[in-house]
Each structure stands twice: as structure tokens, then as C-alpha cells.
């Protein structure tokens, strides 16, 4: 790391080190030999989240309902607003600037991980012994019915999309 001319939380201006403004405040005027750095609090709906020498605060993010967004955490003078998506939707990026509908898992696939506000549904193919006959964002793969436990026999084998069909056992005459 290269050497720095000033302490932490200071910046160099006119060959002198001045204090940075604390989070939640913006720079009004640099320090001089006789005066300290002048800072002002950010206004309503504005923020700065680091020690800084910014002359303007950043605007809080707007969670646009038309894009499926809602406020997860209201911003302060030191933090930005955090958006998330409405129920059934998830963010398209880490910044969560828009939302898309949760994906459904097609027949033959089950839900491995239910979607959240920031991640999509994760599907997995139903393994042998399991099936899913619906398109769903919630349903896991279901195990085939066990005919034996019902004193029945398999009349039709199951697939990844269908359950087995059970029937009565043939009686000896």
C-alpha cells in the first residue's frame, strides 16, 4: 500500500490534511489553518455511508412498485434504502432494481429450494422412486406410492411425472 500524507479519516487539500465528513454528512468547506472542515447533515431522502468529502449526498433508492419492488429497509442519513420484491417475485440482480416472477418447476422436476425475494426457485429432476405431475414453485418431488404397504401390487410403473398405479393382488382360485 502506498504511503499516505494524512491520518485515517483525513484528506489532503492545499498541502494540508483536513478531517473528512462523517457518514450522514456532506462537505460544505475544506479546513484552513484556522478553521475545521465544515460539514452539513444530508437532507431527507439522502444519505452518505462513508467518511467522505462529497459536496452532495446520494438520493435514497426508490423502490418502484411498477417494477414489483417494495421497501425492505427504510434508508437513513447513513444508509441507502433496501428494496425487495413483492410476494411471488424475486430480484433480477444483487442491486434489486427490478423483479421477475418466481420460476415454476415443470412436471418431472421438484422444488429443491423455494425462491426468496432475492433468489429464484431452484428445481431438481425427480430421481427414481419420486415424481412430480404439476408445474409448481413450491411442490417437491413426491415419493411413489408404496403398493406393498397397502397390500396391493404395482399395476403400472411410476415415472418421474407419474405415480405408480396400484391394484389388487391376483387371488388363487
Amino acid at each position: 500500500e502506498p504511503p499516505t500524507a494524512c491520518r485515517e479519516k483525513q484528506y489532503l487539500i492545499n498541502s494540508q490534511c483536513c478531517s473528512l465528513c462523517q457518514p450522514g454528512q456532506k462537505l460544505v468547506s475544506d479546513c484552513t489553518e484556522f478553521t475545521e472542515t465544515e460539514c452539513l447533515p444530508c437532507g431527507e431522502s439522502e444519505f452518505l455511508d462513508t467518511w467522505n468529502r462529497e459536496t452532495h449526498c446520494h438520493q435514497h433508492k426508490y423502490c418502484d412498485p411498477n417494477l414489483g419492488l417494495r421497501v425492505q429497509q427504510k434508508g437513513t442519513s447513513e444508509t441507502d434504502t433496501i428494496c425487495t420484491c413483492e410476494e411471488g417475485w424475486h430480484c433480477t440482480s444483487e442491486a434489486c432494481e427490478s423483479c421477475v416472477l418466481h420460476r415454476s418447476c415443470s412436471p418431472g422436476f421438484g422444488v429443491k429450494q423455494i425462491a426468496t425475494g432475492v433468489s429464484d426457485t431452484i428445481c431438481e429432476p425427480c430421481p427414481v422412486g419420486f415424481f412430480s405431475n404439476v408445474s409448481s414453485a413450491f411442490e417437491k418431488c413426491h415419493p411413489w406410492t408404496s403398493c406393498e404397504t397397502k397390500d396391493l401390487v404395482v399395476q403400472q410403473a411410476g415415472t418421474n411425472k407419474t405415480d405408480v398405479v396400484c391394484g389388487p393382488q391376483d387371488r388363487l382360485r
Epitope: 494524512c6 498541502s15 494540508q16 490534511c17 483536513c18 478531517s19 475545521e36 472542515t37
Partner: antibody, heavy 126, light 107 residues
Framework: QVQLVQSGAEVKKPGASVKVSCKAS????????MHWVRKAPGQGLEWMGW????????NYAQKFQGRVTMTRDTSISTAYMELNRLRSDDTAVYYC???????????????????WGQGTLVTVSS | DIQMTQSPSSVSASVGDRVTITCRAS??????LAWYQEKPGKAPNLLIY???TLQSGVPSRFSGSGSGTDFTLTISSLQPEDFATYYC?????????FGGGTKVEIK
């Protein structure tokens, strides 16, 4: 009362490394930058760099960049200065020195040393 | 880096004399200057900071003045314990730099 107690004298061969410790007592260790200053025989005082014991942040003089490492252990209020690839002209008394309190300074770096360790003589000789 | 030039490099004086040491910075450092006293085998001792503020416990015969590039340390009436080497140090920006020192010797 404030005290900075340094480790004892060291004799090293050229190319070796030395690590000097500085144990602080009598004040809040994390509230003040710690600097290292050296004085070679017949020479003046030379600033080597600082460590902020609170954040662990460091700033080294260009001359020592890549050769010096300053660390601290806040659990025992001790700062360390390690100098690598020693040369004969590194023979000097090495001092730790306490700065003004964090937040004291608004303009300038205003690093004035009100308390010093007793010094550690490092001799580099083949 | 800011160069600090002290003069004279040595001065011979007697007890009771007024001694003046000057320090010049290669660029303006406002009032960010300190003076230290160093005795053989001892760590330096802070005398004055921000060019003219006397450190607690330092006798009032020591005084400092100046701003910008030119600074002065004055010992109004030299005492036997004042025979030592004196250093100025700029505290405007890093790297901190010291003057070459002024040795005050007994005449």
C-alpha cells in the same frame, strides 16, 4: 502513569530480520496512534511510520516500504515493528512513540510525541 | 517530502545566555511544528507543539514562535540541564520529518 516498555537490544547479521516490541500501559492503547522513529549513530531522528492500534491501519515512510511491517496485539496492548533484509546502515536505536489521541486532530496530522519508549538498540554486523 | 533545515548545527553558550535556534521548512506547514530535546542515551522529550504551545511540565524559559516556513525555539536563560541536542519536527503531513538537530554545548 503512561509507560512504553520496549524489548531488549538485538544483534543481527545482514539480510536477517528483527522484531521489536513496545508494551503500552497507563492509557487506552487503542485510542492513540503508535509511531516508530529511529536514530542511527551520529545521525538525526528518522520517522519510519505509524500504526492505528484501533483499526490496524498502517502508514510507512517510502524509504521503508516493503521492508517494514507494523502490527499490534490489542489484547496485551503491544505494538510491534519488524524490519527485514537488514543492512549495516540499519544499526540504530529504534523508538516507539505515542501520538496525540484519535480525534484530537482536525487540521494537519498534528503528530507530536509526548511519550517514548526507552529505545531498542539494533546492531547489524557480520 | 518536506525538508526541515535547522541552524546552527551547534552553538556554544554559557549558563544564563539567551539561545535561539531556527528551523526552516521547504514548504509551508502552517503552525504544525514541534520541538524536542534529546540527551545522550535518552529518548527525545517534547518541549513545544503547534509551534508555540508549551508541553505540560516544560519550564517557561523555553518558547517557540513562527508559522508557514520559519520557526524559532528560544531558551531565555540557559540552565545547566539544557545542554542537549534540539530537533524540530513538522507535523503537517506524512512522512513526518525532523531537522538535523542543533547541539547546545557549554562554552
Amino acid at each position: 502513569q503512561v509507560q512504553l516498555v520496549q524489548s531488549g537490544a538485538e544483534v543481527k547479521k545482514p539480510g536477517a530480520s528483527v522484531k521489536v516490541s513496545c508494551k503500552a500501559s497507563g492509557y487506552t492503547f487503542t485510542g492513540y496512534y503508535m509511531h516508530w522513529v529511529r536514530k542511527a549513530p551520529g545521525q538525526g531522528l528518522e520517522w519510519m511510520g505509524w500504526i492505528n492500534p484501533d483499526s490496524g491501519g498502517t502508514n510507512y515512510a517510502q524509504k521503508f516500504q516493503g521492508r517494514v511491517t507494523m502490527t499490534r496485539d490489542t489484547s496485551i496492548s503491544t505494538a510491534y515493528m519488524e524490519l527485514n533484509r537488514l543492512r549495516s546502515d540499519d544499526t540504530a536505536v529504534y523508538y516507539c512513540a505515542r501520538d496525540q489521541p484519535l480525534g484530537y486532530c482536525t487540521n494537519g496530522v498534528c503528530s507530536y510525541f509526548d511519550y517514548w519508549g526507552q529505545g531498542t538498540l539494533v546492531t547489524v554486523s557480520s | 517530502d518536506i525538508q526541515m533545515t535547522q541552524s546552527p548545527s551547534s552553538v556554544s553558550a554559557s549558563v544564563g545566555d539567551r539561545v535561539t535556534i531556527t528551523c526552516r521548512a521547504s514548504q509551508g506547514i502552517y503552525s504544525w511544528l514541534a520541538w524536542y530535546q534529546e540527551k545522550p542515551g535518552k529518548a527525545p522529550n517534547l518541549l513545544i507543539y503547534t509551534a508555540s504551545t508549551l508541553q505540560s511540565g516544560v519550564p517557561s524559559r523555553f518558547s517557540g514562535s513562527g508559522s508557514g516556513t520559519d520557526f524559532t525555539l528560544t531558551i531565555s536563560s540557559l540552565q545547566p540541564e539544557d545542554f542537549a541536542t534540539y530537533y524540530c519536527q513538522q507535523a503537517n503531513i506524512f512522512p513526518l520529518t525532523f531537522g538535523g538537530g542543533t547541539k547546545v554545548e557549554i562554552k
